[in-house]
């Protein structure tokens, strides 16, 4: 059941990113570190970089509430066992600052791409009977 809940949470994050993509014009047009083509076993490290990024509502009024709620939900921390498991074999993942900085639209697209990749990895690890999650 924990595995299922974990997968639901990851897919929920994908939906949150999708919702935020509707509001890119209401986000502060700041350039943010946006990992891309993340190396195997560095997915959780890159995920953490996305979560740490200062994505912000431009406070332009109408959609401010849903944007702020969504951003806060994107920062929900997964249990450290999940975050640590895939990285146990690799100690040297790139620092957040080393990733190319992108505006909110591309930042969200890259975040979604990483979440999709992690979702597929999780599915395949379950199919092959691995305990990784």
């Amino acid at each position: 059941q924990g595995q299922d809940r974990h997968m639901i949470r990851m897919r929920q994050l994908i939906d949150i990113v999708d919702q935020l993509k509707n509001y890119v014009n209401d986000l502060v047009p700041e350039f943010l570190p946006a990992p891309e083509d993340v190396e195997t076993n560095c997915e959780w490290s890159a995920f953490s970089c996305f979560q740490k990024a200062q994505l912000k509502s431009a406070n332009t009024g109408n959609n401010e509430r849903i944007i702020n709620v969504s951003i806060k939900k994107l920062k929900r921390k997964p249990p450290s066992t999940n975050a640590g498991r895939r990285q146990k074999h690799r100690l040297t993942c790139p620092s957040c600052d080393s990733y190319e900085k992108k505006p909110p639209k591309e930042f969200l697209e890259r975040f979604k791409s990483l979440l999709d990749k992690m979702d597929h990895q999780h599915l395949s690890s379950r199919t092959h009977g691995s305990e990784d999650s």
Epitope: D15, N22, R65, R76
Partner: antibody, heavy 126, light 106 residues
Framework: QVQLVESGGGVVQPGRSLRLSCAAS????????MHWVRQAPGKGLEWVAF????????YYADSVKGRFTISRDNSKNTLYLQMNSLRAEDTAVYYC???????????????????WGQGTTVTVSS | EIVLTQSPGTLSLSPGERATLSCRAS???????LAWYQQKPGQAPRLLIY???SRATGIPDRFSGSGSGTDFTLTISRLEPEDFAVYYC???????FGQGTKVEIK
């Protein structure tokens, strides 16, 4: 069982204040965001306010902003709504509702209000 | 802010018939963010559907939700006497409700 019980409603004059309470039981209150929703007589549902599970963020409908304050005491499993400068248009049944998206990664994940109280009636009249 | 428009305002049907309720959003809504509630007279609302199509705990399978983007639908496949009530859609996050659709006995 999971339960929310509102109290504190009553008849109050315009411009006066009232504090509503919502007692939660049967679940880990401190891991859920909470809402107040109201319903004027014969009307639809109107969301009023939301507070994050740990009280770190609060959101309000424009119609109550600056007049109403949502708060919570996790040690008492209780949600509050302080209503100041009450107006006739605040007359309604006030419901507290649990946000279905738990802060726990492995907890409930519903994007909706999954548990509701029975409501308490507030009448603002001179 | 997003506006949710429900139609029809009232639906007059007989028990056993199929009910189709519509909820249209003024801007695109991620399906995870769309919920449906049922409210009977003198009672609190009850969560029926979350994530546009997932039934909440204890909700019978005659209730189903569908849709994406700006158009969402709640379908009751065969109306039971206890289904006659008011139904509301809601966007999560802004927590805006639609104005409601009343399903009444014909």
């Amino acid at each position: 069982q999971v339960q929310l019980v509102e109290s504190g409603g009553g008849v109050v004059q315009p411009g006066r204040s009232l504090r509503l309470s919502c007692a939660a039981s049967g679940f880990t209150f401190s891991t859920y965001g909470m809402h107040w929703v109201r319903q004027a007589p014969g009307k639809g549902l109107e969301w009023v306010a939301f507070i994050w599970y740990d009280g770190s963020d609060k959101y309000y409908a424009d119609s109550v902003k600056g007049r109403f304050t949502i708060s919570r005491d996790n040690s008492k499993n209780t949600l509050y709504l302080q209503m100041n400068s009450l107006r006739a248009e605040d007359t309604a049944v006030y419901y507290c509702a649990r946000d279905g998206d738990s802060s726990d990664w492995y907890g409930d994940y519903y994007f909706g209000m999954d548990v509701w109280g029975q409501g308490t009636t507030v009448t603002v009249s001179s | 802010e997003i506006v949710l428009t429900q139609s029809p305002g009232t639906l007059s049907l007989s028990p056993g018939e199929r009910a189709t309720l519509s909820c249209r959003a003024s801007q695109s809504v991620s399906s995870s963010y769309l919920a449906w509630y049922q409210q009977k007279p003198g009672q609190a609302p009850r969560l029926l559907i979350y994530g546009a199509s997932s039934r909440a705990t204890g909700i019978p399978d005659r209730f189903s939700g569908s849709g994406s983007g700006t158009d969402f639908t709640l379908t009751i496949s065969r109306l039971e006497p206890e289904d006659f009530a008011v139904y509301y859609c809601q966007q999560y996050g802004s927590w805006t409700f639609g104005q409601g659709t009343k399903v009444e006995i014909k």
